[in-house]
């Protein structure tokens, strides 16, 4: 069964800047990847980026740079300033759509150990 993994990391240089990495573990070819925060898209989440392998990448603030890492994984850097910047417990979700198999999604947030507020 295909699976999606999500990894969230806070940049050490900019404490309110995040990197989200997502990947698809399956045999299908990816048609679209949607990255959202605050929950899944359609369930209260807000779209940060949409990546299409042929038609390009669309991104919305505070997303700074979305890109394909491989044919089945992507990364997204979030700007760390302003009212719309994420906090340590923000949930990020990635949805991979593969035709004609369907869609798979997963969500993740910053591991508690990487919260700078908890470090000594």
């Amino acid at each position: 069964t295909p699976e999606v993994w999500v990894q969230v990391r806070m940049e050490a240089t900019e404490l309110s800047s995040f990197t989200i990495r997502c990947g698809f573990l399956g045999s299908g070819s990816i048609s679209l990847v949607t990255v959202s925060w605050g929950g899944p898209n359609g369930a209260g989440g807000t779209t940060l980026a949409v990546l299409h392998p042929e038609r390009g990448i669309r991104q919305w603030a505070p997303a700074r740079q979305a890109r394909w890492e491989t044919q089945s994984s992507i990364s997204l850097i979030l700007e760390g300033s302003g009212a719309s910047s994420p906090c340590a417990n923000t949930t990020f979700c990635c949805k991979f759509a593969s035709f004609p198999e369907g869609s798979w999604e997963a969500c993740g947030s910053l591991p508690p150990s990487s919260d700078p507020g908890l470090s000594a």
Epitope: L32, N41, E54, P100, G102, S103
Partner: antibody, heavy 120, light 107 residues
């Protein structure tokens, strides 16, 4: 303007064969996933066969597997459905449709349909 | 495969009425639900995608909502031209499956 025009339907004997065609215009045919959907006499809609834009990944309804083959001719902007060993339950109106990645694979354009009647 | 149970099968309404059609999925389909309109003698036409997004040219009296397993399609202020059969469809997992349809008739 996006247009899909089906042809090839008709009256065929039980166990016979038929090849449906769908000529596409108004868009880059090779960039879109395509499918054949049928509407039964009871007006139920069923996705019969689908093909990825890469022309590799395909889907078939369980009841047509091994009997139907979906293919496309990029040079002629044409989608095909080769149907063999036809059964009475294959009697339906057959539509070809385009899937839009950005719309969650919804079928944004449909042809006018071509009728297939399997008689004993 | 995912079963889409659509209710009601028939609706008889007057012009100006508000109409609600529901679709229930046998398992979660996220927000990958589309709604189609099929007028007599015509092929289905896309109305809504991703549950609540209207396709090009679709009037704003058509709205959709829901997530997961329960979805609602509403026509606010029904007009005579809305006489049609309406279908929901999930595209979350292969095979894509349709609801049984709702036939809307105008008094």
């Amino acid at each position: 303007d996006v247009q899909l025009v089906e042809s090839g339907g008709g009256l065929v004997k039980l166990g016979g064969s038929l090849k449906l065609s769908c000529v596409a215009s108004g868009f880059t045919f090779s960039s879109y996933h395509m499918s054949w959907i049928r509407q039964t006499p009871e007006k139920r809609l069923e996705l019969v066969a689908a093909i990825n834009s890469n022309d590799i990944n395909t889907y078939y309804l369980d009841t047509v597997k091994g009997r139907f083959t979906i293919s496309r001719d990029i040079a002629k902007n044409t989608l095909h459905l080769q149907m063999s060993s036809l059964k009475s339950e294959d009697t339906a109106l057959y539509y070809c449709a385009r899937h839009e990645d950005y719309y969650g694979f919804a079928m944004d354009y449909w042809g006018q349909g071509t009728s297939v009647t399997v008689s004993s | 495969s995912i079963v889409m149970t659509q209710t009601p099968k028939f609706l008889l309404v007057s012009a100006g009425d508000r109409v609600t059609i529901t679709c229930k999925a046998s398992q979660s389909v996220s927000n990958d639900v589309a709604w189609y309109q099929q007028k007599p003698g015509q092929s289905p036409k896309l109305l809504m995608y991703y549950v609540s997004n209207r396709f090009t040219g679709v009037p704003d009296r058509f709205t959709g909502s829901g997530y997961g397993t329960d979805f609602t399609f509403t026509i606010n202020t029904v007009q005579a031209e809305d006489l049609a059969v309406y279908f929901c469809q999930q595209a979350y997992r292969s095979p894509w499956t349709f609801g049984g349809g709702t036939k809307l008739e105008i008094k």
